[in-house]
């Protein structure tokens, strides 16, 4: 048996790459990152690794914009090989491709510890709100590749990783306020092995490395000739990027768990979360910080700050991996949610096809793990318990009837949130 690769391809940031194709990733707000090489592997996954630069044996090595590694002047490529890239114009100033600069006044609610980092890449200006690390010195200095000031001697995190590190595109570009946060750190990919990889499609624009996440949030905004405004929403002094969700914080009530707001370009849309009518246990309990009641599980020894124990249990209940795949074409969305179980060893795939908000088709398939491993596009999104899965399937049965006769926009997305197990507050389940 053989997988024919002529039709296999990788999707990365909405672009198709053939198997074996190599490229530099386009990471906002930096533009093309020449110090990272990506390759489309045979199974449709994208593997990216940092370029290792050889030691240069000359006194004044030269940096060339489209090359990662510094070169000695005598080994420079001829001038006619020069890569010509479009420059950008912003606020009356012309910037060259790859040039970084700071902009003012783009984000109305910029926090004091944030700055606006912009870059010119292929004629487009990409700007992001960057949260700067706390400074521990009295006289910070400016550095060329960041809008944040740093203490002298501190190297910017920038793209530094240990040599040759392979990094992955997060399954969710979790900015600080994302509702979709899974408090279980999933393994880098479904496949066994030490390499973290980009699993196929559903790529989010602006892949940030894990170390980059630690230095603060970057909210991507694109500025082109059509719109000079930031595609962000501001709620309660916090900035959210398009597509991000959060619970509103109302002065009189605090955080309202039963309302979920989503940033749609620049306006926020909020809706009430509907809890299941029935639970798989007799006495569901209300927990601080959660909208819906949950079924109490047997007490588990908790790891510090987590409700998962080291065997993959959550509040005493075994957890199972949940995968998701979303495919959109011609106004039709096919959403697949898959649960992997050990007993029996299988993957249950729930397939939803929605056109213009109306459910066209819904069915469930039970396939072997081996068959599932052949499938592209599925991303591990969280781990869940059997009781949460039961709530999900009951809710699914209800909305599959409801959404076949009326328009449903976010019902399935909201239902999927049932599967996310949140870190328990104050250490109780």
């Amino acid at each position: 048996e053989q997988v024919k690769h002529s039709e296999t391809y990788c999707m990365f940031q909405d672009k198709k790459y053939r198997v074996g194709e190599r490229w530099h990733p386009y990471l906002e707000p930096y533009g093309l990152v020449y110090c990272v090489n990506c390759i489309c592997s045979e199974n449709g996954n994208v593997l990216c690794s940092r370029v290792r630069c050889p030691n240069v044996h000359c006194l004044s090595p030269v940096h060339i914009p489209h090359l990662c590694c510094p070169r000695c002047p005598d080994s420079l490529p001829p001038v006619n090989n020069k890569v010509t890239s479009k420059s950008c114009e912003y606020n009356g100033t012309t910037y060259q491709h790859g040039e970084l600069f700071v902009a003012e006044g783009l984000f109305q609610n910029r926090q004091p510890n944030q700055c606006t980092q912009c870059s010119c890449s292929e004629g487009n200006v990409y700007c992001g709100l960057k949260t700067c690390p706390k400074l521990t010195c009295a006289f910070p200095v400016s550095v060329p590749d960041s809008c944040c000031r740093v203490c002298r001697g501190d190297g910017e995190l920038s793209w530094e990783h240990s040599d040759g590190d392979i990094f992955r595109q997060p399954a969710n570009r979790e900015a600080r306020h994302s509702y979709h946060r899974s408090h279980y750190d999933p393994p880098p990919s479904r496949q066994a092995g030490g390499l973290s990889r980009f699993p196929g499609a559903r790529s989010h624009r602006g892949a940030l490395m894990d170390s980059q996440q630690a230095s603060g949030t970057i909210v991507q905004i694109v500025i082109n000739n059509k719109h000079k405004h930031g595609q962000v929403c501001v709620s309660n002094g916090k900035t959210y990027s398009h597509g991000e969700s959060w619970h509103p914080n109302l002065r009189a009530f605090g955080i309202v768990e039963c309302v979920l707001c989503t940033c749609n370009v620049t306006k926020q849309e909020c809706k009430k979360i509907h809890c299941p009518n029935r639970y798989p246990c007799k006495y569901p309990q209300k927990i601080d910080g959660k909208c819906c009641k949950v079924c109490p599980g047997k007490k588990a020894k908790e790891l510090p700050g987590q409700s998962f124990d080291n065997k993959g249990y959550f509040c005493g209940e075994e957890t199972m991996p949940v995968y998701e795949s979303v495919f959109m074409e011609d106004g039709e969305t096919t959403r697949k949610i898959a649960l992997e179980t050990e007993r029996p060893p299988q993957v249950e795939v729930h397939v939803w096809t929605i056109r213009k908000g109306i459910l066209q088709h819904f069915h469930i398939e039970k396939i072997s793990k081996r068959m599932f491993e052949e499938l592209p596009h599925f991303k591990l999104v969280t781990r869940t318990t059997l009781s949460q899965w039961k709530i999900f399937t009951e809710g699914e049965a209800q909305i599959s009837q409801m959404c076949s006769s009326r328009v449903c926009r976010t019902e399935l997305e909201d239902l999927v949130k049932v599967l996310y197990l949140e870190r328990s507050e104050k250490g109780h389940c």
């Epitope: 048996e1 997988v3 024919k4 795949s325 069915h363 072997s368 596009h377």
Partner: antibody, heavy 122, light 107 residues
């Protein structure tokens, strides 16, 4: 009603080529994985090739006996499945069935066409 | 590849009798097994999938059982239209392979 109608079979010489077609109707063709299964005269069934749907990158899979010689493809806009057979051998002589998967990923064969006969002979 | 071994290769039975055909997999395929019926000069038809789930329109006299490596198809009270060849097939992974078949003939 699900219908699969194969065509394109016939007599061909060894090392020759042939392209089989299958016209599908009665179901949402673009969402299902499709297969070709063959049966040599008086013999058992042998799976030949599979093509997944667009949402699975049109991934293709082949039996060892046909790899590098046969190519499975599909045209969702026309609800058509194809099997391009090159460098044919006498052992490729068989009835070729166009088959619809039981689901998106199942790999059990829910619906079969009536078959088209391919004879490879000098 | 997973090998599927079917037995018996052929069997004779009379209308009204009960027959059992068995299928063995070369490795654990859990419940990922399908059964097909093929009448002379016709295309195969799905009878059972996931070892024991009856396909739409299949009479209840057919039943599938087993898991792991050992499976069987039982036909209660044979009817004249039940005579023909029967094939098992695993749907555990790629490539899906078939058993060599069992020819059920009228005694």
């Amino acid at each position: 009603e699900v219908q699969l109608v194969e065509s394109g079979g016939g007599l061909v010489q060894p090392k020759g080529s042939l392209k089989l077609s299958c016209a599908a109707s009665g179901f949402t063709f673009n969402t299902y994985a499709m297969h070709w299964v063959r049966q040599a005269p008086g013999k058992g069934l042998e799976w030949v090739a599979r093509i997944r749907s667009k949402s699975s990158n049109y991934a293709t899979y082949y039996a060892d006996s046909v790899k590098d010689r046969f190519t499975i493809s599909r045209d969702d806009s026309q609800s058509m499945l194809y099997l391009q057979m090159n460098n044919l051998k006498t052992e490729d002589t068989a009835m070729y069935y166009c088959v619809r998967d039981g689901g998106y990923y199942e790999a059990w064969f829910a619906y079969w066409g009536q078959g088209t006969l391919v004879t490879v002979s000098a | 590849d997973i090998q599927m071994t079917q037995s018996p290769a052929s069997l004779s039975a009379s209308v009204g009798e009960t027959v059992t055909i068995t299928c063995r997999a070369s490795e654990n395929i859990y419940s990922y097994l399908a059964w097909y019926q093929q009448k002379q000069g016709k295309s195969p038809q799905l009878l059972v999938y996931h070892a024991k789930t009856l396909a739409e329109g299949v009479p209840s006299r057919f039943s599938g059982s087993g898991s792991g490596t050992q499976f069987s198809l039982k036909i209660n009270s044979l009817q004249p239209e039940d005579f023909g060849s029967y094939y098992c097939q695993h749907h555990y992974g790629t490539p899906p392979t078939f058993g060599a078949g069992t020819k059920l003939e009228l005694k």
